[in-house]
Structures are given as structure tokens and as C-alpha cells.
């Protein structure tokens, strides 16, 4: 089929970075600059993205790909293919319509984007706080209080806060 | 908050140039480019130029030979400059903060060009 | 230069219906659409970004969808405060350039 194809039409021996001609008896021409054609056989070359302003370039358009756009430093994108760049803050802080504030007592933000989210509630699950949280991190939570009553476990004793990935075995 | 505040003149007079200070608050302009756009009345939107943080400038060529954009980062100003205008220019103009998208606009200044 | 052409011009709805407004793009410019609503008198408030993503505060009526060529601005109850001015745009390449506007009015 595809030998059959090529017979019938011409456009389909042009490769990418290429395009079938239609102003040349359909001869493979290159993409002409700033444009670019990721697959063969393509009647014409699509013109390749610019990246301006508040977006840098990331990879450069070749005659066989488009162009990626992402932020300049002090921004992150928003959708899928960086449409829109927003400012970062810091940890410990979210992005309001009056700029970079910090997380309120009881949230936290540990990334430079996104919203300040709450604290886990560690007794929801039966536990206890082992480390306390912060405006850039969350809490740790630890062993539930019955686990540390006096008694409890005669042969380790619990782990110290200082250590909040150690659990007594 | 992010503003952009506009100040400029109502009427121009044919041949004369238009002359538009955007005053922005609640960001810097060392960080953010600004762009211009204008919208005659009951039409679309169109593109016209842009300054950038550091200061380059782009323009949309049907304007290039008529259009200045400057920018004071202290005063955290841009000017907008057309020359030569024409009855067809009858337009409101916008300036705008340049986010990749434009989701910050000013109020608009209505300009018309009439005798 | 790329030119949008939005359909239809204008168009009159009832309060609860639902509307679909398109945008077709001369050129392939990927996801890279934006819509806007203006209301009188007022300056254009972004709705969507990259073709699908709702803007912060954006009610979740409204819905962007399409890629290429091919682009839609869906607006599934419409409420009497939603009647405005449509406008699409690309951002993708400059000069960037806007479609003619769809008006939606109140039938």
C-alpha cells in the first residue's frame, strides 16, 4: 500500500524539514526560516513558535521541530505547553492578587508555586505531632500517644523528635 | 495589587502625534514587559508594539515607522508615541502586562482623531 | 501574519443555555489561545489560556477546548452577567493578533 501510495502521490517521498511544493511540480523544497515540518509528506511547513518576553527559549526550532518556550528566572509556567508564565515566590509563601504573602499560622507551602495548603492532622489517623510544622513545612507526624504512654514498650524507647524518619521498631 | 493606570489625551488632531503614559503599581518593570493594544470602536483588538524588562522593544510592522515605545523603570512608566495619526487610529488603547497571555489590562484610553 | 476568524458575529441566548463560540487560526499555533470577555466599557478580562486553562476565578462553566487550527470557547449555563464580548487570540507568534470578537446577547 504504501509503495502504492508514493506511485500516486509525490508528496509522500518528502521527509521531514521539508515540503511538497505545489508551485515546483510538487518537488521536496526545504522549510523555508522560522518554519518547520515534524513529518513527511506535509503540503506546507508551520511557522515555528517565538518565545519573547517573560518566556526564554528552551530548545530552538529546527526544520524538523518546533520551538519550547519556558520562563525566565523568577517565573514558573502555567499549562501544559508554558501558555503563561507566573511569578514564584518563596517557600513559605503563596501568590495573591497583592503578591507574595506568607502561608497563615496552621498552613504551608514547601515549593516556589501553589497555594498554602494545611497542616495534616495527625490525630485524624491516631498519631501525634513528632516534629511541629512550619510555614514551609508540614508536620511530622509520629507514633499515636498510647504507643509513648509509660510502659507501653519496655525494650525501645521512643524516638527522639530531633529524628522524625525513626520510628521505635 | 497589579494596576495599570493610563493618562493621555481624548482628542488628537489629524496629522498630529498621540501621546499615552501607563503608570503600573504592584509590580516592577526591571521584571515584566508591557505591551500596547488598541481596539476601534465596536471592532477587534490589535497588537501594536511592546517593551521588554530590559528595555528592547518589538513592533508590529504596520506601525513600525510611526510608533515609539519608551519606559522610566524609576518611575515605573511607560510612554506610548504615535506618530501622524489618521481618522482610522480612532481607537481606545490599552496597555497591558506581559505575562505570556494578558491577564492584566489597563482601563483603556479613548482616543479620537478629529478636526 | 496569523489571522483568527471568530464565528458567529453575535448571537442571543436564554439565561441556562449553553453556547459554543469558535476561533479558527490561519496557521497551526498549537494550544497557544487565549480567550477574553469584555463587558461595555470595560477593559478585556482573560478567561482561558493555552486553549483549555481556566484562568484564576474563572467560573467552571467556561471551557476552552481544540488545538491547530480548530478552537472553542464553550460556556455550558449561561448566566445573564456572561453576556459580553468574545474576543480569541494567539500567542504564538508576533505580530500576535486577535480574532474580530463574538457578541453574546440577551435573547
Known amino acids: 500500500f504504501e509503495r502504492t501510495r508514493s506511485l500516486q502521490d509525490p508528496c509522500s517521498n518528502c521527509p521531514a524539514g521539508t515540503f511538497c511544493d505545489n508551485n515546483r511540480n510538487q518537488i521536496c523544497s526545504p522549510c523555508p526560516p522560522n518554519s518547520f515540518s515534524s513529518a513527511g509528506g506535509q503540503r506546507t511547513c508551520d511557522i515555528c513558535r517565538q518565545c519573547k518576553g517573560v518566556f526564554r527559549t528552551r530548545k530552538e526550532c529546527s526544520s524538523t521541530s518546533n520551538a519550547e518556550c519556558d520562563c525566565t528566572p523568577g517565573f514558573h509556567c502555567l499549562g501544559a505547553g508554558c501558555s503563561m508564565c507566573e511569578q514564584d515566590c518563596k517557600q513559605g509563601q503563596e501568590l495573591t492578587k497583592k503578591g507574595c504573602k506568607d502561608c497563615c499560622f496552621g498552613t504551608f507551602n514547601d515549593q516556589k508555586r501553589g497555594i498554602c495548603r494545611p497542616w495534616t492532622n495527625c490525630s485524624l489517623d491516631g498519631k501525634s505531632v513528632l516534629v511541629n510544622g512550619t510555614k514551609e513545612r508540614d508536620v511530622v507526624c509520629g507514633p499515636s500517644p498510647a504507643d509513648l504512654s509509660p510502659g507501653a514498650s519496655s525494650v525501645t524507647p521512643p524516638a527522639p523528635a530531633r529524628e522524625p524518619g525513626h520510628s521505635p521498631q | 495589587q497589579v494596576q495599570l493606570k493610563q493618562s493621555g489625551p481624548g482628542l488628537v488632531q489629524p496629522s498630529q502625534s498621540l501621546s499615552i503614559t501607563c503608570t503600573v503599581s504592584?509590580?516592577?518593570?526591571?521584571?515584566?514587559?508591557v505591551h500596547w493594544v488598541r481596539q476601534p470602536r465596536g471592532k477587534g483588538l490589535e497588537w501594536l508594539g511592546a517593551?521588554?524588562?530590559?528595555?528592547?522593544?518589538d513592533y508590529n510592522a504596520a506601525f513600525i515607522s510611526r510608533l515609539s515605545i519608551t519606559k522610566d523603570n524609576s518611575k515605573s512608566q511607560i510612554f506610548f508615541k504615535m506618530d501622524s495619526l489618521k481618522a482610522d487610529d480612532t481607537a481606545i488603547y490599552y496597555c497591558?502586562?506581559?505575562?505570556?497571555?494578558?491577564?492584566?489590562w489597563g482601563q483603556g484610553t479613548l482616543v479620537a482623531v478629529s478636526a | 501574519n496569523i489571522v483568527m476568524t471568530q464565528s458567529p458575529k453575535s448571537m442571543s441566548m436564554s439565561v441556562g443555555e449553553r453556547v459554543t463560540l469558535r476561533c479558527k487560526a490561519s496557521?497551526?499555533?498549537?494550544?497557544?489561545v487565549s480567550w477574553y470577555q469584555q463587558k461595555p466599557e470595560q477593559s478585556p478580562k482573560l478567561l482561558i489560556h493555552?486553549?483549555?486553562n481556566r484562568y484564576t476565578g474563572v467560573p467552571d462553566r467556561f471551557t476552552g477546548s481544540g488545538s491547530a487550527t480548530d478552537f472553542t470557547l464553550t460556556i455550558s449555563n449561561v448566566q445573564a452577567e456572561d453576556l459580553a464580548d468574545y474576543h480569541c487570540?494567539?500567542?504564538?507568534?508576533?505580530?500576535?493578533?486577535f480574532g474580530a470578537g463574538t457578541r453574546l446577547e440577551l435573547k
Open positions: 504592584g509590580f516592577s518593570l526591571t521584571t515584566y514587559g
Open positions: 517593551i521588554w524588562s530590559g528595555g528592547s522593544t
Open positions: 487570540g494567539q500567542t504564538y507568534s508576533y505580530p500576535l493578533t
Open positions: 496557521e497551526n499555533v498549537g494550544t497557544y
Open positions: 493555552g486553549a483549555s
Open positions: 497591558v502586562r506581559d505575562d505570556g497571555s494578558f491577564a492584566n
